[in-house]
């Protein structure tokens, strides 16, 4: 690895996964690197192999236990290191004291389904995945609907400022194909960010009844 701009960013999914991305300009693609996690008050250590995701960045997931197990708390600090093999030894390339509940990114919401659809309205529900019970109801959501002829980037964001795992979309056009996505964010954490968007849910509004005003 060479000297260059380096960045080491990790997020905790609030249960049993820390996902990390390491980027370094000028680093060699075929260099063998890993992330090592060393908690300050736990008996376990964990390692994952960094795999290339682009020309100068690598990513890996530290799997700390069963997906729904609560492996870390708000008082934990985990020292995270990027180690790269240089000849016969491992060299530390980056290091940070990681506070899991200050760096949260939850899993994307799952199980999206149409609860009820009409000509102009659609009620959709979803579930959150692998989210800590510590949050209680302190979560918020963003949702977006893809209309025909538009892109996701153009879709207006709908904000749900509470833990509400459903939405009623209104003012839709009859007999029209739409797609819907949602993402979640805990209110806690200085560096907390939005989850990835959910898988899109496709749905179609009902056609208008013949001979009636719409």
């Amino acid at each position: 690895a060479v000297n260059g701009t380096s960045q080491f960013t990790c997020f905790y999914n609030s249960r049993a996964n820390i996902s990390c991305v390491w980027s370094q300009d000028g680093a060699l693609q075929d260099t063998s690197c890993q992330v090592h996690a060393w908690p300050d008050r736990r008996r376990w250590n964990q390692t994952c192999e960094l795999l290339p995701v682009s020309q100068a960045s690598w990513a890996c997931n530290l799997i700390l236990g069963a997906p729904d197990s609560q492996k870390l708390t708000t008082v934990d600090i985990v020292t995270l290191r990027v180690l790269c093999r240089e000849g016969v030894r491992w060299r530390v390339m980056a290091i940070q004291d990681f506070k899991p509940f200050e760096n949260l990114r939850l899993m994307a919401p799952i199980s999206l389904q149409v609860v009820h659809v009409e000509t102009h309205r659609c009620n959709i529900s979803w579930e959150i995945s692998q989210a800590s019970h510590y949050f209680e109801r302190h979560l918020e959501f963003e949702a977006r609907t893809l209309s025909p002829g538009h892109t996701w980037e153009e879709a207006p964001l709908l904000t749900l400022k509470q833990k509400q795992e459903w939405i009623c979309l209104e003012t839709l056009t009859p007999d029209t194909q739409y797609e819907f996505q949602v993402r979640v964010k805990p209110l806690q954490g200085e560096f907390t960010t939005w989850s990835p968007w959910s898988q899109p849910l496709a749905f179609r509004t009902k056609p208008a009844a013949l001979g009636k005003d719409t």
Epitope: N3, F8, D40, V82, V92, M93, A94, I95, Q96, D97
Partner: nanobody, 126 residues
């Protein structure tokens, strides 16, 4: 490669003071944190103190807090360890170390450091 040369060690009575210096040369632009470690006879090398590139962050092992102060002068590429109220238990060879690792921790380990000095002997007599 980075070269490190320590100086300032010696024999001192308990309660006395010493100031260790560590001069860095070579690829000093690549240095991030610098630290001091020590190794007493028959014991493993242990972390003493570290300082960030800017000097804004420092960390000490519990046994030296309040007695030792680490500082750095980037213009001179030198790091210092001011040791006050020395105790016989502080007797050891003191090593300066530098790391190119990006970032900061309060839990430095020997393996985090790439470059090492030859060490300077500190002996505290009772």
């Amino acid at each position: 490669e980075v070269q490190l040369v320590e100086s300032g060690g010696g024999l001192v009575q308990a309660g006395g003071s010493l100031r260790l210096s560590c001069a860095a040369s070579g690829r000093t632009f690549s240095i991030n944190a610098m630290g001091w470690f020590r190794q007493a006879p028959g014991k493993e090398r242990e972390f003493v103190a570290a300082i960030s590139r800017s000097g804004g962050s420092t960390v000490y092992v519990d046994g030296v807090k309040g007695r030792f102060t680490i500082s750095r002068d980037n213009a001179k590429n030198t790091v210092y360890l001011q040791m006050n109220s020395l105790e016989p238990e502080d007797t050891a060879v003191y090593y300066c170390a530098a790391t190119m690792a990006v970032g900061w921790t309060t839990r430095w380990r020997t393996a985090d450091f790439d470059s090492w000095g030859q060490g300077t002997q500190v002996t505290v007599s009772s």
